[in-house]
């Protein structure tokens, strides 16, 4: 393993459509991939009138957008379906939405709002 990199070997698995898809609804998914490829976990969810509905959670594979992310954070502003990915075993147990704001006139004391966490 490369120093400082969190190896992902398993992720929290969830499938909202488990009855329709006839799979387990929740569990632990082992992540497989080529030895030279990185493995990640992901979470995807919807915000229906302020209520969080998880769609899927599980393994995600070698995606530069997920590199070195220890926390699962969605940064896109108001997507239809929220998505985040991260590195480290079961790192998708918790996920958050923290949109990157357009940089306007900086204040002398910028405040970083704490992202809401879901699990």
């Amino acid at each position: 393993a490369i120093l400082g990199r969190s190896e992902t070997q398993e992720c929290l698995f969830f499938n909202a459509n488990w009855e329709k898809d006839r799979t387990n609804q929740t569990g632990v998914e082992p992540c497989y991939g080529d030895k030279d490829k990185r493995r990640h976990c992901f979470a995807t969810w919807k915000n229906i009138s302020g209520s969080i509905e998880i769609v899927k959670q599980g393994c995600w594979l070698d995606d530069i957008n997920c590199y070195d992310r220890t926390d699962c954070v969605e940064k896109k502003d108001s997507p239809e379906v929220y998505f985040c990915c991260c590195e480290g075993n079961m790192c998708n147990e918790k996920f958050s939405y923290f949109p990157e704001m357009e940089v306007t006139q900086p204040t002398s004391n910028p405040v970083t709002p704490k992202p809401p966490y879901y699990n």
Epitope: F13, P30, L61
Partner: antibody, heavy 120, light 107 residues
């Protein structure tokens, strides 16, 4: 070497059944998602269903519900797809495929395909 | 059922060209979009999964982008071995559905 090796070509009569086998090697068969996809001559691709052997229960496309049965034998790392009440439109190449993840991220390892011809 | 459409259905190009194939989903599929290449008499080959990451062993001249309902596959500096049929597939919700394919031919 990661591979899926399928059984040979079949010629069947309308109304009969066919069972295609798919032997896996080089990966963790029991905890992998194995799907079946078919392709009629000169046509596109059609997903039929799939299963994760440790879960045991297959997930089928509505179109094939009641006519297709997907099973797996963990002891021999072999998946099976049985299609019943065959009709001429079922003439196609049938592929077994390994998915990258349980959430169907992509079909990365394909069998060589099994040609099933339905003809009277 | 989510319906996938591809455009164009066929196109002619020359070695060295850059081509773009578009795939649209009838409803949002987030990032659950894969691209496959198929040559006559062969099984399809996974090129791209999750809308943009490249599958193992796929040359970097292939790239994918998009999310939701609109996706593209771009092949830059076409090589002779790239002339084939390309399919997109959504795996966001069952039944997982494929586009009708785009046949890439040599001009």
């Amino acid at each position: 070497q990661v591979q899926l090796v399928q059984s040979g070509a079949e010629v069947k009569k309308p109304g009969s059944s066919v069972k295609v086998s798919c032997k896996a090697s080089g990966f963790q068969f029991r905890t992998s998602l194995i799907s079946w996809v078919r392709q009629a001559p000169g046509q596109g691709l059609e997903w039929m269903g799939g299963l994760i052997p440790i879960f045991g229960t297959a997930n089928y496309a509505q179109k094939f519900q009641g006519r297709v049965t997907i099973t797996a034998d963990e002891s021999t790392s072999t998946a099976y797809m049985e299609l019943s009440s065959l009709r001429s439109e079922d003439t196609a190449v049938y592929y077994c495929v390994k998915d990258l993840t349980w959430t169907n991220l992509g079909l990365d390892i394909w069998g060589q395909g099994t040609m099933v011809t339905v003809s009277s | 059922e989510i319906v996938m459409t591809q455009s164009p259905s066929s196109l002619s190009a020359s070695v060295g060209d850059t081509v773009t194939i578009t795939c649209r989903a009838s409803q949002g599929v987030s990032r659950w979009l894969a691209w496959y290449q198929q040559k006559p008499g062969k099984a399809p080959r996974l090129l791209i999964y999750g809308a943009s990451p490249l599958s193992s062993g796929v040359p970097s001249r292939f790239s994918g982008s998009g999310s939701g309902t609109h996706f593209t596959l771009t092949i830059s500096s076409l090589q002779p071995e790239d002339f084939a049929t390309y399919f997109c597939q959504q795996s966001y919700s069952t039944p997982f559905t494929f586009g009708p394919g785009t046949k890439l031919e040599i001009k």
